[in-house]
Amino acid sequence: AVLTQKQKKQHSVLHLVPINATSKDDSDVTEVMWQPALRRGRGLQAQGYGVRIQDAGVYLLYSQVLFQDVTFTMGQVVSREGQGRQETLFRCIRSMPSHPDRAYNSCYSAGVFHLHQGDILSVIIPRARAKLNLSPHGTFLGFVKL
Amino acid sequence: AVLTQKQKKQHSVLHLVPINATSKDDSDVTEVMWQPALRRGRGLQAQGYGVRIQDAGVYLLYSQVLFQDVTFTMGQVVSREGQGRQETLFRCIRSMPSHPDRAYNSCYSAGVFHLHQGDILSVIIPRARAKLNLSPHGTFLGFVKL
Amino acid sequence: AVLTQKQKKQHSVLHLVPINATSKDDSDVTEVMWQPALRRGRGLQAQGYGVRIQDAGVYLLYSQVLFQDVTFTMGQVVSREGQGRQETLFRCIRSMPSHPDRAYNSCYSAGVFHLHQGDILSVIIPRARAKLNLSPHGTFLGFVKL
């Protein structure tokens, strides 16, 4: 169909903020559960600890986590799981000070990736019981379909 | 031509990951050589330590480098060279801990810039023999034509 | 109207760099005054310490500040003020080393948000007399209309 000026710019977008973060007893990771704060389009679906891709294509993904932890290095890994395999897309790593009063760092990263229909995107902190700040302006996750 | 729904969203994109990193003997810099991990469109061409702009326009550029170095500050400079001059577009700077076990930081930055046909974009670390982690999900470079 | 290939890609963009940074005597904040370095479209207007949204919609916002300060944590808050209320959109936080020679960090963050006509966007450093580096490639602010 011919595009109007208004239709032209409608990139699907999804900006998510945390509901909570949990660690499984048997694994050295902390996962974040997400809820939409801004959504445009139907190609992305938050579900529990992941985001399901319903509309394949090239996306700008971004992730920030706000850490309050004296563990010497902290960070997050953004991965996609689909077609029977898991792939790390990008990660963010931050050295943390050893003093609790100073141990406060946000870690932001982003990139452009091809995502497939049915992929599940997740943000993993490879630390059990990681001390995160779940403020919606400190920890968030986002997608823009390009 | 009238745009179809499919044509509408085809931003040219290029996401690059490292092949290697080298230092010249006579200069206090480390340069990264790049290879495409994701490409859409023909307006950008990886060539050695740079990316050649074949299609002028406004681009979102992003850069991340993962440092494993105890030098007190590390970071990267994203520059364009063209029309006989070099221009720094943006830079990322990260203070590093002095203990090798803690000296692990990614540095991400990005911005929107007008790039000219023939420009060569490069990522320079202003340190000879900088200790980088060249994992493709830790160190990368990207472009989105807007 | 039918879009030509050229019209298709014209996202409004604005990339701003600092003019100066000041602290009000009676408040524990430092504000940055901005000037455009790159502008495409008319939907955004730099005015003093803020950016006025003239064209409502969904925007990718990004902010980087380069800190040269030994205060234990530094960072910036990106907020919008409009319709009689203020809302924090996102923030960046960086722990700083206590030694002045090492106290050098850029802090970058970004996200996608719906901005309303008349909103004023600002970058606040919640520290009086924060020591910032106002280099245009170290401290900047940007918008892309999606």
Epitope: - | I93 | Y104, S135
Partner: antibody, heavy 121, light 107 residues
Framework: EVQLVQSGAEVKKPGASVKVSCKAS????????MHWVRQAPGQGLEWMGY????????KYNEKFKGRVTMTSDTSASTAYMELSSLRSDDTAVYYC??????????????WGQGTTVTVSS | DIVMTQSPSTLSASVGDRVTITCKAS??????VAWYQQKPGKAPKLLIS???NRDSGVPSRFSGSGSGTEFTLTISSLQPDDFATYFC?????????FGQGTKLEIK
């Protein structure tokens, strides 16, 4: 106390080379770069480049590339600047000056006393 | 290269005067500007870095301001020891460049 002590005055013939030394004390030598700046008689200051003792890597002003060599000896906490193919307009006072290790975004906070180099036939 | 243009090149003033020296950069250098004082036969001495930060031990009568392309060094009340040549320098972009200097002399 930070101190930078430079070698003595030199008189050289055109085409020759000169090597100036700068011995640092009072700080960790490898944590700072050493800039070299020159000043022709009655003229302003001109940045020539720096040596980073941490990795013994230089950064040169393009104007001097091919003629200047900057090195360091960490065991002696000493930086060196050698200028070759000397011309009469290289007659100047040559200063070493300390800058922080990231080089950019830091001023030169301590300076040596200067070394006068005279190029004359 | 970035050109740093200082004015005036010579300034005559008296003890107790307030004097201002300006420096204009040919392109935006943020606040990455330093001011140095040099006396005859001596090395330059750092007064101000980051456009406005006084170096340790520098008297409070010296102040710097500006960002972007326009910078000023102000001496609020001239003392006999202040008669010297002053240089601005940008350290935002390689090669680092200096102004041509302002000679402050006794009126």
């Amino acid at each position: 106390e930070v101190q930078l002590v430079q070698s003595g005055a030199e008189v050289k013939k055109p085409g020759a080379s000169v090597k100036v030394s700068c011995k640092a004390s009072g700080y960790t030598f490898t944590s700072y770069v050493m800039h070299w700046v020159r000043q022709a008689p009655g003229q302003g200051l001109e940045w020539m480049g720096y040596i980073n003792p941490y990795n013994d890597a230089p950064k040169y002003n393009e104007k001097f590339k091919g003629r200047v060599t900057m090195t360091s000896d960490t065991s002696a906490s000493t930086a060196y600047m050698e200028l070759s193919s000397l011309r009469s307009d290289d007659t100047a006072v040559y200063y070493c000056a300390r800058g922080l290790g990231y080089a950019l975004y830091y001023a030169m906070d301590y300076w040596g006393q200067g070394t006068t180099v005279t190029v004359s036939s | 290269d970035i050109v740093m243009t200082q004015s005036p090149s010579t300034l005559s003033a008296s003890v107790g005067d307030r004097v201002t020296i300006t420096c204009k950069a040919s392109q935006n250098v943020g606040n990455n500007v330093a001011w140095y004082q040099q006396k005859p036969g001596k090395a330059p001495k750092l007064l101000i870095s980051s456009a406005s930060n006084r170096d340790s031990g520098v008297p409070s009568r010296f102040s710097g301001s500006g960002s972007g392309t326009e910078f000023t060094l102000t001496i609020s009340s001239l003392q006999p020891d202040d008669f010297a040549t002053y240089f601005c320098q940008q350290y935002n972009i390689y090669p680092f460049t200096f102004g041509q200097g302002t000679k402050l002399e006794i009126k």
